[in-house]
């Protein structure tokens, strides 16, 4: 019936932990891809869309080789926190047009939140230094028009897709070094 009191709990295999994180990330990447297709289908918008408040893409795939696990996880968590905030903002601020993307957008938010908790757990299991709590981010500016909101949605989902794609490749590469 469990280890005797005071004895250290058996630490799960970090590679298995990383595997399940990759699985979650892959699943979220697919959710994001599907939602992006839905958004483009319902609200076509040509060209690239940028949002100044979004994080810049962490790293090109080619530069992944030089990365270390702590820096990847730290950066990934920070970027995904930003995307979570943007998805929450999107769901509350964007008007009835984007309500047609529910419940998928809500599911995306829930799964993004779950991935963030998983990353936090992974960082503690790997005994990585815990980050101080993030300073409160400035509130996101309201869209000036519905169209501005739609463009923001394209930018958020497009950026999240790229970030998750980078994350899957980065985590798989780092797993080989554990």
């Amino acid at each position: 019936p469990g280890p005797p009191p005071g004895s250290p709990r058996a630490s799960p295999d970090p590679r298995a932990e990383l595997d399940s994180t990759v699985l979650l990330t892959r699943s979220l990447l697919e959710d994001t891809r599907q939602l992006t297709i839905q958004l483009k289908d319902k609200f076509p918008a040509d060209g690239d869309h940028n949002l100044d408040s979004l994080p810049t893409l962490a790293m090109s795939a080619g530069a992944l080789g030089a990365l270390q696990l702590p820096s990847v996880l730290t950066r990934l968590r920070a970027d995904l926190l930003s995307y979570l905030r943007h998805v929450q903002w999107l769901r509350r601020a964007m008007g009835s047009s984007l309500k047609t993307l529910e419940p998928e957008l809500g599911t995306l938010q829930t799964r993004l939140d779950r991935l963030l908790r998983r990353l936090q757990l992974l960082m503690s299991r790997l005994a990585l230094p815990q980050l101080p709590p993030d300073p409160p981010a400035p509130p996101l500016a309201p869209p000036s028009s519905t169209w501005g909101g739609i463009r923001a949605a394209h930018a958020i989902l497009g950026g999240l897709h790229l970030t998750l794609d980078w994350a899957v490749r980065g985590l798989l590469l780092l797993k080989t070094r554990l």
């Epitope: 319902k42 601020a93 964007m94 008007g95 529910e102 309201p142 519905t146 169209w147 909101g149």
Partner: antibody, heavy 117, light 111 residues
Amino acid sequence: QVQLVESGGGVVQPGRSLRLSCAASGFTFSHYDMHWVRQAPGKGLEWVAVISYEGSNKFYADSVKGRFTISRDNSKNTLYLQMNSLRAEDTAVYYCARTPGFHFDYWGQGTLVTVSS
Amino acid sequence: QSVLTQPPSASGTPGQRVTISCSGSSSNIGSNYVNWYQQLPGTAPKLLIYYDDLRPSGVPDRFSGSKSGTSASLAISGLRSEDEADYYCSAWDDSLSGVVFGGGTKLTVLG
């Protein structure tokens, strides 16, 4: 400056139809969702319907569903509300309103619809 | 019966601070932004507060909005006679797929 001007109101008998228009100017009409909101005499505000910026998505209040149709013509910068099977309880001032999200940042002056026999 | 609940009336004397409450549920105020409108007698409503606590340009900083859980409130400090009007709260409701309003609060400035 932003302007919304409603027209088409008047006195109509129960069961009849009426079409309201809202002419927009001073902004890029096709970039905004548009709503209709009404106010019965001496009563509060009641949301009626919304149409998305490009016209494909529409939502209605339960009280008008199946009777009212919201539409828009972006080439004419005009919003419409087709009201069929009118009832006495539809008597109200009807406002069109612009929205960048869920808040109405500009309102028209309103047009009065009276349903009476 | 309105989906959002507001007191039917409120009053105060010039210079005073008054607060108008707006109570809703998890499907409206709890998960969406709250807006406040002022309607002066015989005129169309005017946006006063949006995104829970933001003021459009031209609205004096005497007006402020706040939200906690499924309730919101509008505070008016330094009350003036021209503030006498009807005030409405509103939010999108996810269950109804539409905008909901409070029944409105008639503010009277005494004296």
